[in-house]
Amino acid sequence: ELCDDDPPKITHATFKAVAYKEGTMLNCECKRGFRRIKSGSPYMLCTGNSSHSSWDNQCQCTSSAARNTTKQVTPQPEEQKERKTTEMQSQMQLADQVSLPGHCREPPPWENEATERIYHFVVGQTVYYQCVQGYRALHRGPAESVCKMTHGKTRWTQPQLICTGETEPSQFPGEEEPQASPDGLPESETSR
């Protein structure tokens, strides 16, 4: 079941997942000047069976100016800078990361995608927080948030993290060692 809200916002911090639970949706958003191809799906969906999970549908963007063409443009240097969030997500995906049952990995970028990814998370998803560059983490507990539910009421737990002005960025907890999710599995990354 989908979580009603977005994960909590922490000042000077970003969050991500390490893997996405089946049922998670990722909007097919395009950057300015581009739009989703007419026949294209509005979102990608993490689906699977007992042994394997993957993203259904592929996002495709086409120039808003062009008609019925899927010609895609290589991002220029200034556009690449714009894509920092998505690139950070891609870098987080370790090649040797073990696939988790019932989970999808971070989908690879698609050409001309928007700078920010919008996920629709499902109950049981864990996201991990880290302070942005220039801020240091003060932990009172785990820097993670879980989407929990009881009979249709969903809520994200509050991450125990404060980011204070410093010089070095902190690690994502998921990068240091896997953390247990409500399903007893380490979860995965997301930014919204």
Epitope: E1, V123, K148, M149, H151, G152, P182
Partner: antibody, heavy 121, light 112 residues
Framework: QAYLQQSGAELVRSGASVKLSCTAS????????IHWVKQRPEQGLEWIGW????????EYAPKFQGKATMTADTSSNTAHLQLSSLTSEDTAVYYC??????????????WGQGTLVTVSA | DVVLTQTPLSLPVSLGDQASISCRSS???????????LEWYLQKPGQSPKLLIY???NRFSGVPDRFSGSGSGTDFTLKISKVEAEDLGVYYC?????????FGGGTKLEIK
């Protein structure tokens, strides 16, 4: 494996209060909602309420408002149910249970063994 | 409050027979999110209840496929295709769609 261990049976005087505990192992209670259920001798199940241990938010069935108070201590992974101004009507087994969710299920999948509260005159 | 009425109160069966328990609600128990949080629990003597079925028709892990749930709106049914000795006990339906959640009165499955 998730498990809920409840405190032992209580014999209490009419008018007094009692505090029951429910300690979880195998999972963090802050990531779930903990519910309490009452069962009077030879009778059915009655939902008392739930607590969100992460922030202390609670929801009570109207008939248990003022009678029951749910609290939680995440440091000990324990939920508590306090019953006040006890009468013979409160003589029952009290269960804690967790609303558990996974890729393919959601419901009260794990229950404590129950605590029998006997109210004496 | 939503009232769940279970029938029959007592259900005597022979082992190997099919058993059917009805649960009717006083109002629709479709949640505002479109889901129907109707569950079935079995409580054996001296034990805590155990989850059998969630969201009307989904079997919980480890529950034998002789148990099946069906229904919609206000009318729900639990069927046991071939009753075994370990199935004896009291069955409760439960709705979590409306606050406060409520249990049915229970149906005792016993040997004829």
């Amino acid at each position: 494996q998730a498990y809920l261990q409840q405190s032992g049976a209580e014999l209490v005087r009419s008018g007094a209060s009692v505090k029951l505990s429910c300690t979880a192992s195998g999972f963090n209670i802050k990531d779930y909602y903990i519910h309490w259920v009452k069962q009077r001798p030879e009778q059915g199940l009655e939902w008392i309420g739930w607590i969100d241990p992460d922030n202390g938010e609670t929801e009570y069935a109207p008939k248990f408002q003022g009678k029951a108070t749910m609290t939680a201590d995440t440091s000990s992974n324990t939920a508590h149910l306090q019953l006040s101004s006890l009468t013979s009507e409160d003589t029952a087994v009290y269960y804690c249970t967790v609303f558990w969710y996974g890729n393919n299920y959601a419901g009260f999948a794990y229950w404590g063994q129950g605590t029998l509260v006997t109210v004496s005159a | 409050d939503v009232v769940l009425t279970q029938t029959p109160l007592s259900l005597p069966v022979s082992l190997g027979d099919q058993a059917s328990i009805s649960c009717r609600s006083s109002q629709s128990i479709v949640h505002s999110n479109g889901n129907t949080y109707l569950e079935w629990y079995l409580q054996k003597p001296g034990q805590s209840p155990k989850l059998l079925i969630y969201k009307v028709s989904n079997r919980f892990s480890g529950v034998p496929d002789r148990f099946s749930g069906s229904g919609s709106g206000t009318d729900f049914t639990l069927k046991i295709s071939k009753v075994e000795a370990e199935d004896l006990g009291v069955y409760y339906c439960f709705q979590g769609s409306h606050v406060p959640p409520t249990f049915g009165g229970g149906t005792k499955l016993e040997i004829k």
